[in-house]
Amino acid sequence: NFMYSKTVKRLSKLQEYQQYYPSLTCVMEGKDMEDWSCCPTPWTSFQSSCYFISTVMQSWTKSQNNCSVMGADLVVINTKEEQDFITQNLKINSAYFLGLSDPKGWRHWQWVDQTPYNKNVTFWHSGEPNSPDERCAIINFRSEEWGWNDVHCHVPQKSICKMKKIYI
């Protein structure tokens, strides 16, 4: 009976999410393997988040709007482990917008989700950021490593979206 009601609840939650995400990929987790954590297909998952790499070349603002329409934001990177996971799926000759910008050009960087910008947990390439006119951040591969660079916000780039996992 308990399992039956849990299944019914799960199905109604799935139907609710299906309006927004035609297909979800779910895995069982939790100490009793009773919880399902899901990401929209074909998003990838890491810890408590889902990631989507957009190969459409768009400005930073349009990229953020595009993520927003999918219930996500441009990616906020909180740890080196998270960055290492993300970069496994990136192409080394491409650049991807992050959810990090400095709209006034005062070098006051801010994350799209209002996570405090912590200078100690940043992965700028050597010498970056280097221009007050370059107010948006990308991740790219340079000098044999992945790192961040400030670029013009209006220049079209690929992008990475991030959203919280869906728990059902």
Partner: antibody
Framework: EVQLVESGGGLVKPGGSLRLSCAAS????????MSWVRQAPGKGLEWVST????????YYPDSVKGRFTISRDNAKNSLYLQMNSLRAEDTAVYYC??????????????WGQGTTVTVSS | DIVLTQSPASLAVSPGQRATITCRAS??????????MHWYQQKPGQPPKLLIY???NLESGVPARFSGSGSGTDFTLTINPVEANDAANYYC?????????FGGGTKVEIK
């Protein structure tokens, strides 16, 4: 006082080349992105190319891509536009304009007086 | 590319009256309260001159008779009251994404 002075325009045959120059004064040239904008006779404004302050980024519309090259010499406070394989539709007044960044975009806050390019056989 | 459509293409206004020019973008040029639409004035034989930046900010030295408003896809330049030396072409321009694009222009004539 900010000044932008274009030169190098003239009459050229289709398929020919021209190099436009823009001499900048009255501001720290190396700190600003710069653009070329053109205006065909009796027509509106059309952006032609952009170069970032540090020379790291150049951008062109499809109409001139592969034929025009924008460059700058910050030591000489000068902006250039090398125009090759010119066509009749490139006939226009070419303006050099300074970009001023605002939030996620920019606008053109100073313009030169323009130099006229005529492509005709 | 973002297409900007200006209307009307031309208008004749008497001195002391109000002139209103609109610019419609093919997609939004606003983001979180910032509107990346700008307005220029161009008199015959002269280069364009910046009037308004970011939809509503008056450029230094431009008379307060000029004002701008709008957000998203719809923007307006207003001249009130119009003076004789306002006869010119007026252009809108967006910069939210490359390539930067201009409207087709509006010719303002003084009656």
């Amino acid at each position: 006082e900010v000044q932008l002075v274009e030169s190098g325009g003239g009459l050229v045959k289709p398929g020919g080349s021209l190099r436009l120059s823009c001499a900048a004064s009255g501001f720290t040239f190396s700190s600003y992105g710069m653009s070329w904008v053109r205006q065909a006779p009796g027509k509106g404004l059309e952006w032609v190319s952009t170069i970032s302050s540090g020379d790291s980024y150049t951008y062109y519309p499809d109409s001139v891509k592969g034929r025009f090259t924008i460059s700058r010499d910050n030591a000489k406070n000068s902006l250039y536009l090398q125009m090759n394989s010119l066509r009749a539709e490139d006939t226009a007044v070419y303006y050099c304009a300074r970009q001023l960044y605002y939030s996620y975009g920019y606008y053109f806050d100073y313009w030169g007086q323009g130099t006229t390019v005529t492509v005709s056989s | 590319d973002i297409v900007l459509t200006q209307s009307p293409a031309s208008l004749a206004v008497s001195p002391g009256q109000r002139a209103t020019i609109t610019c419609r973008a093919s997609e939004s040029v606003s983001f979180h309260g910032t509107h990346l639409m700008h307005w220029y004035q161009q008199k015959p034989g002269q280069p364009p001159k910046l009037l308004i930046y970011a939809a509503s900010n008056l450029e230094s030295g431009v008379p307060a008779r000029f004002s701008g408003s709008g957000s998203g896809t719809d923007f307006t330049l207003t001249i009130n009251p119009v003076e004789a030396n306002d006869a010119a072409n007026y252009y809108c321009q967006q910069s939210i994404e490359d390539p930067p694009t201009f409207g087709g222009g509006t010719k303002v004539e003084i009656k």
